[in-house]
């Protein structure tokens, strides 16, 4: 059902927005411990004027690699809704063009047996910091599309 703009962004507000907000709400505590360093993904992929669809397409693809990371069923369900819902709605709005096949997400460093607990914890925190930022950017980008603002 391609009812994203026709009825005040109904599909977005009733499905995507709810899931994004649920996810962000569950990640409220994350942020203060996040490193200041910019993630490569956000250096390269920007929700810029005329490139919103391109950004959201890649962001949705990136989200998929976080499935099963958090272990709670609700969390995964909301992630799936945001990822698949974004892809579906992009097709509805004609904002995304076909791309060559791509691997899911950036290559992760291989874990050695000696990797200690604190490094694993730091990596998980880093992943969650990234995921929170990704969800915030997806939300902002969808809002930009729905408001029709074409700010350069």
């Amino acid at each position: 059902d391609c009812d994203i703009e026709g009825k005040d962004g109904k599909q977005y507000e009733s499905v995507l927005m709810v899931s994004i907000d649920q996810l962000l709400d569950s990640m409220k505590e994350i942020g203060s411990n996040c490193l200041n360093n910019e993630f490569n993904f956000f250096k390269r992929h920007i929700c810029d004027a005329n490139k919103e669809g391109m950004f959201l397409f890649r962001a949705a693809r990136k989200l998929r690699q976080f499935l099963k990371m958090n272990s709670t069923g609700d969390f995964d369900l909301h992630l799936l809704k945001v990822s698949e819902g974004t892809t579906i709605l992009l097709n509805c709005t004609g904002q995304v063009k076909g791309r060559k096949p791509a691997a899911l997400g950036e290559a992760q460093p291989t874990k050695s047996l000696e990797e200690n607990k604190s490094l694993k914890e730091q990596k998980k925190l880093n992943d969650l910091c990234f995921l929170k930022r990704l969800l915030q950017e997806i939300k902002t980008c969808w809002n930009k599309i729905l408001m029709g603002t074409k700010e350069h």
Partner: antibody, heavy 117, light 111 residues
């Protein structure tokens, strides 16, 4: 429309310092990474540094000991502090807004820095 | 650092000609299904202008006669039918690995 205007260039003696500014308008400055790129007379382009939305920085290691990039989001301004200047730093210095694929989507007109005794 | 070797360094062409500029990287610019190479046009006394980003995406407002292709280490900028305003210097730039680096430029002159 997006506008970037560099200032602060001029003639400076070797060994001295200079601070370049880049005033941004026409977009939400705090939401974008910004870069400094330079071009020596008659030569190619050379990336110097970038500063991201959260304030983290990336440098070309060839310049990281002498050049410092910073930003003031409240003034919509980007800076490049250049120390221990050399004759080979003579160039037009451009600021550029980060674009998709970490390209340089928008450029200022450039400011000329001449290092000469 | 990744070296970007552009060729030719200069070329002479006529209006209407198909022009091809190549850029060879010292290591692959591919990541996650995309090629991190961008192309710029620069006219004397002016700042560069972005033409193509991420290998093959034409920047908004750039004429369709400009196109980018390639993957891995070998990339091409093509101008399908050269126009009078296209006489300029063209640069490739990689953004796969810091430091970001440019090719040496290709000057397109009138024959």
């Amino acid at each position: 429309q997006v506008q970037l205007v560099e200032s602060g260039g001029g003639v400076v003696q070797p060994g001295r310092s200079l601070r370049l500014s880049c005033a941004a308008s026409g977009f939400t400055f705090s939401s974008y990474g910004v870069h400094w790129v330079r071009q020596a007379p008659g030569k190619g382009l050379e990336w110097l540094a970038a500063i991201w939305t959260g304030g983290s920085t990336d440098y070309n290691s060839a310049f990281s000991s002498r050049f410092t990039i910073s930003r003031d989001n409240s003034k919509n301004t980007l800076y490049l502090q250049m120390n221990s200047l050399r004759a080979e730093d003579t160039a037009v210095y451009y600021c550029a807004r980060n674009g998709y694929g970490e390209s340089f989507a928008y450029w200022g007109q450039g400011t000329l820095v001449t290092v000469s005794s | 650092d990744i070296q970007m070797t552009q060729s030719p360094s200069s070329l002479s062409a006529s209006v209407g000609d198909r022009v091809t500029i190549t850029c060879k990287a010292s290591e692959s610019l591919d990541h996650d299904g995309d090629s991190y190479i961008n192309w710029y046009q620069q006219k004397p006394g002016k700042a560069p202008k972005l033409l193509i980003y991420m290998g093959s995406n034409v920047e908004f407002g750039v004429p369709a006669r400009f196109s980018g292709s390639g993957s891995g280490t070998d990339f091409t900028l093509t101008i399908s039918s050269l126009q009078p305003e296209d006489f300029a210097t063209y640069y490739c730039q990689q953004s796969n690995v810091d430091p970001l680096t440019f090719g040496g430029g290709t000057k397109v002159e009138i024959k």
